[in-house]
């Protein structure tokens, strides 16, 4: 069964800066990755970035840099101040569309006890089957 993992880290140098890393553990071919915050995409969440393996990468404030780390994992740096700034209990979700498995989504947030610059290990979060 495919899995999606999500890791959220607050940067020690900039307390309003977060790094989200997501990966897909499956044998299929990834066709699209969508990163959102505030909940799953399409269920009240706000899209921060869309990454297509061949068509390109798109991102919107407060996302600063989205990129492919490998063929099956991505990272997104967020920064902001004011209303659009993430906070410690913000939920971030990553949705991977793949063939032939379909769409798989997982969400994560900053571990409550983590110090700036630290993060929980990238463990698979609860998986939502989207289709």
């Amino acid at each position: 069964t495919p899995e999606v993992w999500v890791q959220v880290r607050m940067e020690a140098t900039e307390l309003s800066s977060f790094t989200i890393r997501c990966g897909f553990l499956g044998s299929g071919s990834i066709s699209l990755v969508t990163v959102s915050w505030g909940g799953p995409n399409g269920a009240g969440g706000t899209t921060l970035a869309v990454l297509h393996p061949e068509r390109g990468i798109r991102q919107w404030a407060p996302a600063r840099q989205a990129r492919w780390e490998t063929q099956s994992s991505i990272s997104l740096i967020l920064e902001g101040s004011g209303a659009s700034s993430p906070c410690a209990n913000t939920t971030f979700c990553c949705k991977f569309a793949s063939f032939p498995e379909g769409s798989w989504e997982a969400c994560g947030s900053l571990p409550p006890s983590s110090d700036p610059g630290l993060s929980a290990p990238p463990t698979p979060a609860p998986i939502l089957r989207a289709d």
Epitope: S36, G45, T46, T47, P53, E54, R55, W60, T70
Partner: antibody, heavy 114, light 113 residues
Framework: EVQLQQSGPEVVKPGASVKISCKAS????????INWVKQSHGKNLEWIGD????????NYNQKFKGKATLTVDKSSGTAFMGLRSLTSEDSAVYYC???????WGQGTTLTVSS | DIVMTQSPSSLSVSTGEKVTMSCRSS????????????LAWYQQKPGQPPKLLIY???TRESGVPDRFTGSGSGTDFTLTISSVQAEDLAIYYC?????????FGGGTRLEIK
């Protein structure tokens, strides 16, 4: 089938403002993220910017900052582009297109003339 | 901004001939993380909006005839039409799909003899 329906041609005077619309009807999330492209003299294509329907966040080509303002009405699936302080240099065909430019509107011709 | 340079600016061929056109970017369009090139090709016929032909430098968009082939990597890319048809009369544009602003080339106008 994704469709992008743009508003009709505009003829405006120099110094005026105009607002062009693009109504999207699509199947997936990415069909509602809209790019705007300017085509001058029937040839040169320039990316103006894009808009996120979730929160109205836009990315702009630096060249068009202060000239173009991108907005969206998520409930109706309509994106808008406002253009201000118009000059003859703004006369062009303006297109909207989906996130990865795989579907395009029919184009809106803007003529700025006194 | 990434500058996209296309050549030639125009060419004239007979139907059935093979044609190649070039696109060069001022910076690499290769995404190091997944080793994909973020370059697209468009066809624009008179009075119509551009139509996406190729993305990822070499992947044909759905419904595009297989006589259209994209190739290249990094900064140098080519669009090849293996056997030109009368309906291929158009201007062909390449686009940087890697980095905002998503710049277009100046186009190659294909004329049919």
């Amino acid at each position: 089938e994704v469709q992008l329906q743009q508003s009709g041609p505009e003829v405006v005077k120099p110094g005026a403002s105009v607002k062009i619309s693009c109504k999207a009807s699509g199947n997936t999330l990415t069909d509602y993220f809209i790019n705007w492209v300017k085509q001058s003299h029937g040839k040169n294509l320039e990316w103006i910017g894009d808009i996120n329907p979730d929160n109205g966040a836009g990315n702009y080509n630096q060249k068009f900052k202060g000239k173009a303002t991108l907005t969206v009405d998520k409930s109706s699936g309509t994106a808008f582009m406002g253009l201000r302080s118009l000059t003859s240099e703004d006369s062009a065909v303006y297109y909207c297109a989906t996130l990865y430019f795989d579907y395009w509107g029919q184009g809106t011709t803007l003529t700025v003339s006194s | 901004d990434i500058v996209m340079t296309q050549s030639p600016s125009s060419l004239s061929v007979s139907t059935g001939e093979k044609v190649t056109m070039s696109c060069r970017s001022s910076q690499s369009l290769l995404n190091s993380g997944n080793q994909k090139n973020y370059l697209a090709w468009y066809q624009q016929k008179p009075g119509q909006p551009p139509k996406l032909l190729i993305y990822g430098a070499s992947t044909r968009e759905s419904g595009v005839p297989d006589r259209f082939t994209g190739s290249g990597s990094g900064t140098d890319f080519t669009l090849t039409i293996s056997s030109v048809q009368a309906e291929d009369l158009a201007i062909y544009y390449c686009q940087n799909a890697h980095t905002s602003p998503y710049t277009f080339g100046g186009g190659t106008r294909l004329e049919i003899k």
